[in-house]
C-alpha cells in the first residue's frame, strides 16, 4: 500500500504541477523602439519585444505584432503607454493632442476587431514648454479563447516613450472557463 | 485501504492548502503621511504602512522602505500615486510640474536599481486655481527572485496625497517560475 | 488497489476542479449608458451591465448598483473611468472640472462606507476646444468578506463615456484568507 500511496502522491504532484503551469499563460511585451511608426494618426503597434529585459512570454505566442492566446481562459490584460516630447526633438505639428490607447481583440474565425479597453486624454502641449510627458494605464479581466489575438493601437505613435518601463502591455491567465 | 485513502486525502489536503498559501505572497502598502519628504526633487519613498487600514502583507517583508520578495515567482505589481495642492497649504514653487512615479527593483546580489514601470504627467498647475489634483496608476507582471526589493520613487513628494486610498503600492504572486 | 487509486484520483480531480472554480469569483461590469445620472456632483453609479458584451460575473452578485462579495478572499479590484465632452453636446457648466472616481466598500453589518481607491485629475476644459477626453484607472489588492459591497462613485457623471471599453470596473479573487 505504501508503494501505491507513493505512486498516487507522485502522480498527483506531477498532475498538480503540470496543470498549474499549463493553466497560467502570461506575457509582458515591451515596445520595440527601433520600429515605432511616425505620424499622429491612430495606428496598430506591431513591434514589441518578448524576450529581452522585462519582456517575457509563456504559453502564449507573439506573431505579426499581435499577442495570440493559446489557451482558453479568463485573463487580466493591462497596458501602460507613455507619450513624451522634448523641444530638442523638433516642433509639434499641433499643440492640441489626443493621446489615446486602445486594447483590441481580434478573432480569426470571425475576422473582426473589438476594443476591450481604451484610455487617454486630450492635452494642450504648449510650444513654450521645454518638456511634456503623459502616461495612460488600462487594465481589465476578459474571457479569451485560443486563437484570439490582442493588439495595441495608439494615436500619435511618434510621441511614444521607447523605454521598456514606459510603454508595454501584457496578460496573465487567472482562471479556466467553467 | 480506506484508512490509507483517508491518509492520502488528508495529506493531500494539507499539501494543497499549504502549497497554495505559500505560493501566494502579497502586499498592499499605504503611504505613511507622518513622514513624507519635502521638496520637489525625485526621492525614494521609505515610509509605508503594512498593517493598518487597507495595508497588509503576507509572505513578503517590508524593511527600510522597501518591499522584499521572500519567494521566487511571477508577480503582478501595481502603484497608485495621487498628488494634490490646495492654496490654503501655501504656494507652489513653480506652476510647471513633472508629476512622476517610478517602480524600481533592486537586487542585493548585484547592487543596482532598475525601473520596472513609470508613469506620470507634466502639469500646469496655475497659482490662480484654488485646488489641483492628479493621480497616476501603473501595473505590470514581473519575475521576482527571493531577496529582490521593490521601491517607489516620486517627484514632488511634498504634493503627495496622504490618504490610504490615494497613495499606495502592492504586489501579489500569480504563479511560480517554471 | 488499482480501483482504489482510480477512486482517489477521481475524487481528487473533482475536488481540485470544484475548489478551484469556487475559489475564483470574478466580475467585469460595464457602464449602462441608458441610465447615467446628470449633473456635476459626486454620485454613486448604480447602473451597470453584468451579462452583455464584455460584462460578466461569476460567484459574485450584482444588486442595487453594487457588486456583492459572496466568498471571503483577497481580490484584485480595478476601475477604468472615461470622461469626454464634445462641443456639439452643448456647453460645459464650468471649464474647471474635478474628474474623480472613488471605489468604495460597504459592510452591511456595520453600515458604513469606506473608500478603497481614488483617482482622477483637475482639468481645464476650455470652451475653445472642440473635444475633450480623460481617463482614470485605479487598481488594488483588498481583503473582502462575504456580504461586503463594492460600488463606484464619480464626479461629473454627465461627462462619462458610455462605451463598454471606456467605463467599467471589476474584481477577481486571487487567494483565500488564511
Amino acid at each position: 500500500i505504501r508503494a501505491e500511496k507513493a505512486m498516487v502522491d507522485g502522480s498527483w504532484l506531477d498532475l498538480a504541477k503540470r496543470s498549474k503551469l499549463e493553466a497560467q499563460p502570461f506575457a509582458h511585451l515591451t515596445i520595440n523602439a527601433t520600429d515605432i511608426p511616425s505620424g499622429s494618426h491612430k495606428v496598430s503597434l506591431s513591434s514589441w519585444y518578448h524576450d529581452r529585459g522585462w519582456a517575457k512570454i509563456s504559453n502564449m505566442t507573439f506573431s505579426n505584432g499581435k499577442l495570440i492566446v493559446n489557451q482558453d481562459g479568463f485573463y487580466y490584460l493591462y497596458a501602460n503607454i507613455c507619450f513624451r516630447h522634448h523641444e530638442t526633438s523638433g516642433d509639434l505639428a499641433t499643440e492640441y493632442l489626443q493621446l489615446m490607447v486602445y486594447v483590441t481583440k481580434t478573432s480569426i474565425k470571425i475576422p473582426s476587431s473589438h476594443t476591450l479597453m481604451k484610455g487617454g486624454s486630450t492635452k494642450y502641449w504648449s510650444g513654450n514648454s521645454e518638456f511634456h510627458f503623459y502616461s495612460i494605464n488600462v487594465g481589465g479581466f476578459f474571457k479569451l479563447r485560443s486563437g484570439e489575438e490582442i493588439s495595441i493601437e495608439v494615436s500619435n505613435p511618434s510621441l511614444l516613450d521607447p523605454d521598456q518601463d514606459a510603454t508595454y502591455f501584457g496578460a496573465f491567465k487567472v482562471r479556466d472557463i467553467d | 485501504i480506506r484508512a490509507e485513502k483517508a491518509m492520502v486525502d488528508g495529506s493531500w489536503l494539507d499539501l494543497a492548502k499549504r502549497s497554495k498559501l505559500e505560493a501566494q505572497p502579497f502586499a498592499h502598502l499605504t503611504i505613511n503621511a507622518t513622514d513624507i519628504p519635502s521638496g520637489s526633487h525625485k526621492v525614494s519613498l521609505s515610509s509605508w504602512y503594512h498593517d493598518r487600514g487597507w495595508a497588509k502583507i503576507s509572505n513578503m517583508t517590508f524593511s527600510n522602505g522597501k518591499l522584499i520578495v521572500n519567494q521566487d515567482g511571477f508577480y503582478y505589481l501595481y502603484a497608485n500615486i495621487c498628488f494634490r495642492h490646495h492654496e490654503t497649504s501655501g504656494d507652489l514653487a513653480t506652476e510647471y510640474l513633472q508629476l512622476m512615479v517610478y517602480v524600481t527593483k533592486t537586487s542585493i546580489k548585484i547592487p543596482s536599481s532598475h525601473t520596472l514601470m513609470k508613469g506620470g504627467s507634466t502639469k500646469y498647475w496655475s497659482g490662480n486655481s484654488e485646488f489641483h489634483f492628479y493621480s497616476i496608476n501603473v501595473g505590470g507582471f514581473f519575475k521576482l527572485r527571493s531577496g529582490e526589493e521593490i521601491s517607489i520613487e516620486v517627484s514632488n513628494p511634498s504634493l503627495l496625497d496622504p490618504d490610504q486610498d490615494a497613495t499606495y503600492f502592492g504586489a501579489f504572486k500569480v504563479r511560480d517560475i517554471d | 488497489i488499482r480501483a482504489e487509486k482510480a477512486m482517489v484520483d477521481g475524487s481528487w480531480l473533482d475536488l481540485a476542479k470544484r475548489s478551484k472554480l469556487e475559489a475564483q469569483p470574478f466580475a467585469h461590469l460595464t457602464i449602462n449608458a441608458t441610465d447615467i445620472p446628470s449633473g456635476s456632483h459626486k454620485v454613486s453609479l448604480s447602473s451597470w451591465y453584468h451579462d452583455r458584451g464584455w460584462a460578466k460575473i461569476s460567484n459574485m452578485t450584482f444588486s442595487n448598483g453594487k457588486l456583492i462579495v459572496n466568498q471571503d478572499g483577497f481580490y484584485y479590484l480595478y476601475a477604468n473611468i472615461c470622461f469626454r465632452h464634445h462641443e456639439t453636446s452643448g456647453d460645459l457648466a464650468t471649464e474647471y472640472l474635478q474628474l474623480m472616481v472613488y471605489v468604495t466598500k460597504t459592510s452591511i453589518k456595520i453600515p458604513s462606507s469606506h473608500t478603497l481607491m481614488k483617482g482622477g485629475s483637475t482639468k481645464y476644459w476650455s470652451g475653445n476646444s472642440e473635444f475633450h477626453f480623460y481617463s482614470i484607472n485605479v487598481g488594488g489588492f483588498f481583503k473582502l468578506r462575504s456580504g461586503e459591497e463594492i460600488s463606484i462613485e464619480v464626479s461629473n457623471p454627465s461627462l462619462l463615456d458610455p462605451d463598454q471599453d471606456a467605463t467599467y470596473f471589476g474584481a477577481f479573487k486571487v487567494r483565500d484568507i488564511d
Partner: antibody
C-alpha cells in the same frame, strides 16, 4: 501667528547699495512666496518682486530687474532684498509681505524707511 | 502689465453715508472662475491692511460695512455707512498675473 519683522531704517548715498532683511515666523517659511512692495513718500504702493524660499525661485518687476535681487536664508527664515545703484527716487518705505491663506496680501512687515540723499 | 485705474482720486463723505470707490483694470483679472482683485486700507504711518480678497470676500476681522463686487475689469469697494476710523487711503490690487500691480489709491476724507 504669522509675523514679519523687518530691519531698521537706512540712510544711503546715491550710487550705493542697500540690503534689507525680513524675518518670518509663525508659518513654514519655505511654502509661501515672500513679496516686496515699496511706497515713496506721499505716493502709492508699488510691487517690486517676490521669492519662493524653498528652491529660491524669484520673480521681479521689469522696472527693477537689473538692480534688484531677492534672496533667502532658509535656516534663519529670513528674506533679503538688495537694491543697487540707488537714486534719490528710491527713497521709500519698503515692505515685505505674504499672501493670506486664500488670496490678497494679508501679512505685512512694519516697513523699512530707506532714504537716499547726497 | 495690467494697469489699475482708481476713481475718484479722493472723496469726502459724511459720517453714516455710503462711500463707493471704483477700480478698472486694463484687462480681465478673472481666471479659474475667480476674480483676482483685492482691496486694502492704509492709514497714515501704517502698513496696508487687507479688507477684501478675491473681489468680494471679507477678510477676517474686517467690519461688515465693507463689501466688494465686480468681475473681469470693473470692481467696486463699498462702505455702507462710513465711520470716523475709515478715514484712510484705499488701494485695489490684482494678482492674476505677474507683475502684480496696485491702483493709484483713493483718499477718503470724513466730512
Amino acid at each position: 501667528q504669522v509675523q514679519l519683522v523687518q530691519s531698521g531704517a537706512e540712510l544711503k548715498k546715491p550710487g550705493a547699495s542697500v540690503k534689507l532683511s525680513c524675518k518670518a515666523s509663525g508659518y513654514t517659511f519655505t511654502t509661501y512666496w515672500l513679496q516686496w512692495v515699496r511706497q515713496a513718500p506721499g505716493q502709492g504702493l508699488e510691487w517690486m518682486g517676490a521669492i519662493y524660499p524653498g528652491p529660491g525661485n524669484t520673480k521681479y518687476t521689469q522696472k527693477f530687474k537689473d538692480r534688484f535681487t531677492i534672496t533667502a536664508d532658509k535656516s534663519k527664515s529670513t528674506a533679503y532684498m538688495q537694491l543697487n545703484s540707488l537714486k534719490s527716487e528710491d527713497s521709500a518705505v519698503y515692505y515685505c509681505a505674504r499672501r493670506g491663506s486664500r488670496r490678497g496680501i494679508a501679512y505685512w512687515g512694519q516697513g523699512t524707511l530707506v532714504t537716499v540723499s547726497a | 502689465n495690467i494697469v489699475l485705474t482708481q476713481s475718484p482720486a479722493s472723496l469726502s463723505v459724511s459720517l453714516g453715508q455710503r462711500a463707493t470707490i471704483s477700480c478698472r483694470a486694463s484687462e480681465s483679472v478673472d481666471s479659474y472662475g475667480r476674480s483676482f482683485m483685492h482691496w486694502y486700507q492704509q492709514r497714515p504711518g501704517q502698513a496696508p491692511r487687507l479688507l477684501i480678497y478675491l473681489a468680494s470676500n471679507l477678510e477676517s476681522g474686517v467690519p461688515a460695512r465693507f463689501s466688494g463686487s465686480g468681475s473681469r475689469t470693473d470692481f467696486t469697494l463699498t462702505i455702507s455707512s462710513v465711520e470716523a476710523e475709515d478715514e484712510a487711503t484705499y488701494y485695489c490690487q490684482q494678482d492674476n498675473e505677474d507683475p502684480y500691480t496696485f491702483g493709484g489709491g483713493t483718499k477718503l476724507e470724513i466730512k
